[in-house]
């Protein structure tokens, strides 16, 4: 297994739609065919997986069917995007890439991009 | 130039297992995820799923689940799909479609489950 | 599984028409792609990534759409547009087609 350095952005806001987007570069040392990006929540010292797609050649990232990511590729840079954020979710987003073919295996792993969500106040009642 | 070539139509028992292969050539095999389709008589496509031929990466349609197997054998560049427990449902053309665009699709072979 | 749905189902037109045809996902997906398939012929790429031509594909088709409405239009049908034309996204797995939409001559 070999490191790669993996860049990512150390604090981005959701939006008031519970939407996050953030861009995970990584710097791959060769060609690499298949890659694998794995997003892990670090929050209390507990870390889970957000979500995980391998992609080859092709810019779309696919995701399981009960994911709440989506996200593009464009050469060396993740577009991620985090969808259905609750206050509750605030935390650290970590960005792991994986070159998995051909080998060397290499494995990078970000700093981590802190996601700060806000749940939306409640709508006043309005007279209009 | 990109090719694939699939075996020819097999008639099978129900219950019985069928496997298709598809030979890749005019690219790099490892390259290119290798996706399977079927389409049932006068219906639309289903995907049954994909194989990362370099590290033989595998996803499945859940439906398909236990029923089918994809494997690949570099050395050849050709991918197989292998699925048992077949009934008359399974009756369709299975195509092998190249990568992430589904680019590259080769005629089909027609699976006919069949007492 | 995201489901996609195709409008119309079936379609008549004339050489020379503009058409139309949509794709509604059931859930937010990031692109569309689009194929063509005639009668004993394995599906042919159409457009990719919603508005991409394929390589060949003439530039009377055309796609758009985003999140969750999508749409294929052929600017003046030409009599090899007869076909049935399928949506797929590649978003979450497994992927999914729309049903089709099959182009018949008027």
């Known amino acids: 297994c070999k490191a790669m350095h993996v860049a990512q952005p150390a604090v981005v806001l959701a939006s008031s739609r519970g939407i996050a987007s953030f861009v995970c570069e990584y710097a791959s040392p060769g060609k690499a065919t298949e890659v694998r990006v794995t997003v892990l929540r670090q929050a209390d010292s507990q870390v889970t997986e957000v979500c995980a797609a391998t992609y080859m050649m092709g810019n779309e990232l696919t995701f399981l069917d009960d994911s709440i990511c989506t996200g593009t590729s464009s050469g060396n840079q993740v577009n991620l995007t985090i969808q259905g954020l609750r206050a509750m979710d605030t935390g650290l987003y970590i960005c792991k890439v994986e070159l998995m073919y051909p080998p060397p295996y290499y494995l990078g792993i970000g700093n981590g991009t802190q996601i700060y969500v806000i749940d939306p106040e409640p709508c006043p009642d309005s007279d209009f | 130039q990109v090719q694939l070539v699939q075996s020819g139509a097999e008639v099978v028992k129900p219950g019985a297992s069928v496997k298709v292969s598809c030979k890749a050539s005019?690219?790099?095999?490892?390259s290119y995820w290798i996706n399977w389709i079927r389409q049932a008589p006068g219906q639309g496509l289903e995907w049954i799923g994909r194989i990362a031929p370099g590290s033989g990466t595998t996803y499945y349609n859940e439906m398909f689940t236990g029923r089918v197997t994809l494997t690949r054998d570099t050395s050849t560049s050709t991918a197989y799909m292998e699925l048992s427990s077949l009934r008359s449902e399974d009756t369709a053309v299975y195509y092998c479609a190249r990568g992430d665009y589904f680019d590259y699709w080769d005629q089909g072979t027609m699976v006919t489950v069949s007492s | 599984d995201i489901q996609l749905t195709q409008s119309p189902s079936f379609l008549s037109a004339s050489v020379g028409d503009r058409v139309t045809i949509t794709c509604s996902a059931s859930?937010?997906?990031?692109?569309i792609h689009w194929f063509q398939q005639k009668p004993g012929k394995a599906p042919k790429l159409l457009i990719y990534?919603?508005?991409t031509l394929a390589s060949g594909v003439p530039s009377r088709f055309s796609g758009s759409g985003s999140g969750t409405e999508y749409t294929l239009t052929i600017s003046s049908l030409q009599p090899e547009d007869f076909a049935t034309y399928y949506c797929q996204q590649r978003t979450t797995y497994p992927l999914t087609f729309g049903q089709g939409t099959k182009l018949e001559i008027k």
């Open positions: 005019g690219y790099t095999f490892t």
């Open positions: 859930k937010s997906v990031s692109y």
């Open positions: 990534d919603t508005s």
